[in-house]
């Protein structure tokens, strides 16, 4: 069970912690593109130049709410778009090509690294001030897809990370005698 | 799925201090806020502080500053809670909380018993 | 520092019962409350915030309204895994104080 997802004035969801969100929707022109941040693309399937091919990261601002409260200053969020596939195939809206073979895997541009950033809350009534930490994209990478797999079951192509699928992260056993192993009942 | 597991009971001596652990797993504590909640027996719940780990940021409840450090070992993801000049009445139940915000707490540990008797 | 006074400070009742819980700030606290369960030996579980938000996986027969000094906890039809002690807790100003807690036991 992850954090909650923080809403921002747009009515979009930024994830909170420990979510990791579908890439949205692939046609929203009122986004800043940038390819791939200044890294070179991940390969997909057989490539034969790196350069052919796309995975385009789109980068907007927003305000973030939570409750009432607002962020004193707009977050840069970084999407990842569409498929992965050659550039010189690609669209400035990414279009569903199958550019290998009909049969064969589909490559989608998916989060790749995530970054937690704190927020200062300007929040009407209360005196107190309020911070919130909102998980972010960091990097998009390519990840297969084969038609018998459902979109969960993204076989990575790029170099490995250890950042462990939802949020979970393997750790040892908490230490000393004294630690209560007893797991937490904090979800219904 | 996120899990707080906090070190054992402890007996203390008036004037003493005590230094309970909570290690976080599924999250690292760094990404988080973690906050300190007392229950004296029998009573209601009481707010002690929080800390960002991050940055090594903290908010006391003035009740308890100057005799509260809250501090994390972002290495192992533990935080630790350390209270001094102890008295009976700090007998209690401290729980560790994490989350997202300074202000609410969405995952506890399952709480550290503090007996303070000479 | 702000008072949250909970009242009743125990109830009875059944299974299928409505109940409501209500809890009241000494000053003005906008929407920055929230609602806890704690049962006997555990630790405390999030139910909502911001008066009125529903935190992950709570069910619906959980609901919370109330803004200024008043605020509601209701649970629309109890149901076993309900009886427990329920505390309101604001964040409008330092330091967060908890109300005294409503006790739910089994009539």
């Known amino acids: 069970q992850g954090w909650q997802a923080f809403r921002n004035d747009a009515t979009e969801v930024i994830p909170g912690l420990g979510e990791y969100p579908e890439p949205p929707p692939e046609n929203n022109q009122t986004m800043n593109r940038a390819e791939n941040g200044g890294r070179p693309p991940h390969h997909p399937y057989d490539a034969k130049d790196v350069s052919e091919y796309s995975c385009r990261e789109l980068h907007y601002t927003r305000f973030l709410t939570d409750g009432p409260c607002r962020s004193a200053k707009p977050v840069t969020e970084l999407v990842c778009s569409g498929q992965c596939g050659p550039a010189r195939l690609l669209p400035n809206a990414i279009g569903r090509v199958k550019w290998w073979r009909p049969n064969g895997p589909d490559f989608r541009c998916i989060p790749d690294r995530y970054r937690a950033q704190r927020v200062q809350l300007l929040c009407p009534g209360g005196a107190a001030p309020r911070s919130r930490k909102v998980r972010l994209v960091a990097s998009c990478k390519c990840k297969r897809l084969t038609r018998f797999h459902n979109q969960s079951e993204l076989k990575d192509f790029g170099p490995e990370t250890a950042r462990p699928q939802k949020g979970r992260k393997p750790r040892p056993g908490a230490r000393g005698a004294k630690a209560n192993q007893a797991e937490l009942e904090n979800a219904y | 799925q996120v899990q707080l597991v906090q070190s054992g009971a402890e007996v203390k001596k008036p004037g003493a201090s005590v230094k309970v652990s909570c290690k976080v797993s599924g999250f690292p504590i760094k990404d988080t806020f973690q906050h300190w909640v007392r229950q004296a027996p029998g009573k209601g719940l009481e707010w002690m502080g929080w800390?960002?780990?991050?940055?090594?940021?903290?908010e006391y409840a003035s009740k308890f500053q100057g005799r509260v450090t809250m501090t994390e070992d972002t290495s192992t993801d533990t935080a630790y809670m350390e209270l001094s000049s102890l008295r009976s009445e700090d007998t209690a139940v401290y729980y560790c909380?994490?989350?997202?915000?300074?202000?609410?707490?969405?995952?506890w540990g399952q709480g550290t018993t503090v007996t303070v008797s000479s | 520092d702000i008072q949250m006074t909970q009242s009743p400070s125990s109830l009875s009742a059944s299974v299928g019962d409505r109940v409501t819980i209500t809890c009241k700030a000494s000053?003005?606290?906008?929407?920055?409350v929230a609602w806890y369960q704690q049962k006997p030996g555990k630790a405390p579980k999030l139910l909502i915030y911001w008066a009125s938000t529903r935190w992950t996986g709570v069910p619906s027969r959980f609901s919370g309204s109330g803004s200024g000094t008043d605020f509601t906890l209701t649970i629309s039809s109890l149901q076993p895994e309900d009886f427990a002690t329920y505390y309101c807790?604001?964040?409008?100003?330092?330091?967060?104080?908890f109300g005294g807690g409503t006790k739910v036991e089994i009539k």
């Open positions: 800390s960002d780990p991050e940055i090594g940021d903290t």
């Open positions: 807790q604001q964040y409008s100003d330092y330091p967060w104080t």
């Open positions: 909380a994490t989350g997202d915000t300074t202000y609410k707490f969405d995952f």
């Open positions: 000053q003005d606290v906008h929407t920055a």
